[in-house]
Interface confidence: medium
């Protein structure tokens, strides 16, 4: 299915724990902390064995002469994120001893900007997408992915970093947003809600989806994530909404069936390589694009967001597994790990297709469409 009120197509739980780790699901849960009614929460951290917060753990990409490694952005501030007033967040956070500015959480104090000033920036993510206000840009060509179909070996690291479940990707996954806009995939992670409560980060005309996948990329113009942070186009994230469908999604099941092994915050397991592109919608030609930020501290701006119009379908059981298996720190379930939508502040969301045409049955009055600002660059 397409996004609601957008036109045409859209498809994540399931599973039981991987048979190779019968002991794997032992972390300490407990009641969710009371959500704070302040600001929104933010998104994953920048990677490394220690999972420092910042948006999704961003593995370091070194020059070709060096080995690829995992980036510990220990110099980046991290914070506890305030809660989304409409969708309270769980107070999952990560503490780093000896530094009270090195942890953040969904739904708690202090406000993110207090620790990472960029979180108060004008061009933050996620945002609410209003298709009728999107600028149709014919120059936005279909996305190109190369090397995303991974063989079973070598295995990949699947980790519960306390903020999300993250799959670290090996070198060689290339993505192009267009001519000269080339990126390397670093990692993917998910955002979700709780029972009966959706948890996507982006919304469409205020509609929040059950979950959302983010595939994080580093521009080939940069050798390292820390060099790219805050630079326009330095990072790019492919985002897709996950919806409930009638059938089990076999691609997602390869990951979801292993979640019990990493129920504990900070735990990880190895999973066979898989077709990463199968986790994304099949239509790479229809998407929304805008410039925003990481959705967790350090909230660095300049991130190019590409949000697919088509959604991905998972079974109800799979969505339940996603939202009900993992634990964060502090004896709390890892749920509702999304940041509230941020104001556009004049930004125009571009669409690779005429999204404003007959796409929103709710629209009662004609809407002035924005014009395409980019020349397709």
């Amino acid at each position: 299915q397409r996004l609601p009120r957008m036109q045409e197509d859209s498809p994540l739980g399931g599973g039981s724990s991987g048979e190779d780790d019968p002991l794997g699901e032992e972390d300490l849960p407990s009641e969710e902390d009371s959500p704070r009614e302040e600001d929104p929460p933010g998104e994953e951290d920048l990677p490394g064995e220690e999972d420092l917060p910042g948006e999704e753990d961003l593995p370091e990409v070194k020059p070709k002469s060096e080995e690829e490694g995992s980036l510990k952005l220990e110099d980046l501030p991290t914070v506890e994120a305030p809660g989304d007033p409409q969708e309270p967040q769980n107070n999952a956070h990560r503490d780093k001893e000896g530094d009270d500015q090195s942890h953040w959480r969904y739904g708690g104090d202090p406000p993110w900007p207090r620790v990472s000033p960029a979180c108060a920036g004008r061009f933050q993510s996620p945002v609410d997408i209003r298709p009728q206000l999107a600028a149709f840009c014919p120059a936005l060509r279909p996305l190109e992915l190369l090397g995303f179909q991974l063989p079973p070996l070598p295995e990949l690291r699947l980790r519960n970093n306390g903020h999300s479940v993250q799959l670290t990707l090996p070198p060689g996954l290339e993505m192009a947003l267009g001519p000269g806009r080339e990126y390397r995939a670093l990692q993917l992670h998910l955002h979700w809600g709780a029972a009966g409560r959706p948890g996507s980060e982006h919304t469409v005309e205020g509609h929040r989806f059950p979950a959302e996948i983010h595939v994080v990329h580093l521009s080939t113009a940069f050798a390292r994530v820390d060099e790219a942070l805050g630079r326009p186009g330095g990072l790019a994230v492919l985002a897709a909404f996950l919806e409930e469908g009638p059938e089990e999604n076999s691609a997602y099941e390869q990951l979801l069936s292993r979640l019990e092994e990493i129920a504990e915050e900070g735990s990880e397991t190895q999973v066979p390589g898989l077709d990463i592109s199968a986790l994304l919608p099949s239509d790479f030609s229809r998407y929304f694009q805008y410039e925003g930020s990481l959705t967790t501290p350090p909230c660095a701006q300049g991130v190019i967001w590409t949000v697919f119009n088509q959604t991905v379908m998972l079974s109800a059981k799979q969505l339940h597994t996603l939202s009900d298996t993992l634990w964060g720190p502090g004896d709390s379930r890892l749920q509702l790990n999304f940041r509230a939508t941020q104001p556009l502040n004049g930004r125009v969301i571009e669409a690779s297709f005429p999204a404003g045409v007959d796409s929103s049955p709710r629209a009662a009055e004609p809407v002035q469409l924005n014009s395409c600002l980019a020349a397709g660059d």
């Epitope: 190779d20 699901e25 032992e26 407990s30």
Partner: antibody, heavy 118, light 105 residues
Amino acid sequence: ELVESGGGLVQPGGSLRLSCAASGFTFSSYGISWVRQAPGKGLEWVSSISYSGSNTYYADSVKGRFTISRDNSKNTLYLQMNSLRAEDTAVYYCARMKPMRGYSGAVWGQGTLVTVSS
Amino acid sequence: DIQMTQSPSSLSASVGDRVTITCRASQDISNRLAWYQQKPGKAPKLLIYDANSLQSGVPSRFSGSGSGTDFTLTISSLQPEDFATYYCFQYSGPTFGQGTKVEIK
């Protein structure tokens, strides 16, 4: 703390149900296992159950004969043992075996002796 | 199934000795290995997890190393209370090694 009970003498082919009462930690948050040790022998993992109870695992030596279950409302783990054999004679421990960063690591009960003999 | 081969099956040592016990997995288990100490009539006690992480409260004379298929437990200076049986345990499977009994020479 984990406290096992239900052990005893049983004839070959008979059945026995072991219980393990948990206290002092959030039982419903942990996968729990049964491990046994035959007299004078080493440790043998028998079975495990995930914290929700939705996933169970068994050693080949007991598959089809033993059933692990849990009642999180009672903070209790069970092991139903059917078709018992002489080689099942052992001290049975319930254990939260997989260590976890930041938590108390492994927790074991004191064990309960099961003797299968005619 | 993953098999764990522990050696030696027994050893005699004196107080103050450096003792090394090895465990080999039949296939790669990354660092998913623990070491337990057991004394007669008692439940096992966790010493090391994740191959080299010392469990809280365990004396620093115990250390673990290794990754993949080959692992080692080292007691740097054997103390009287260390005479016991030691088991490696891989929690990918899970399976125990057959045990190493450390006796007084």
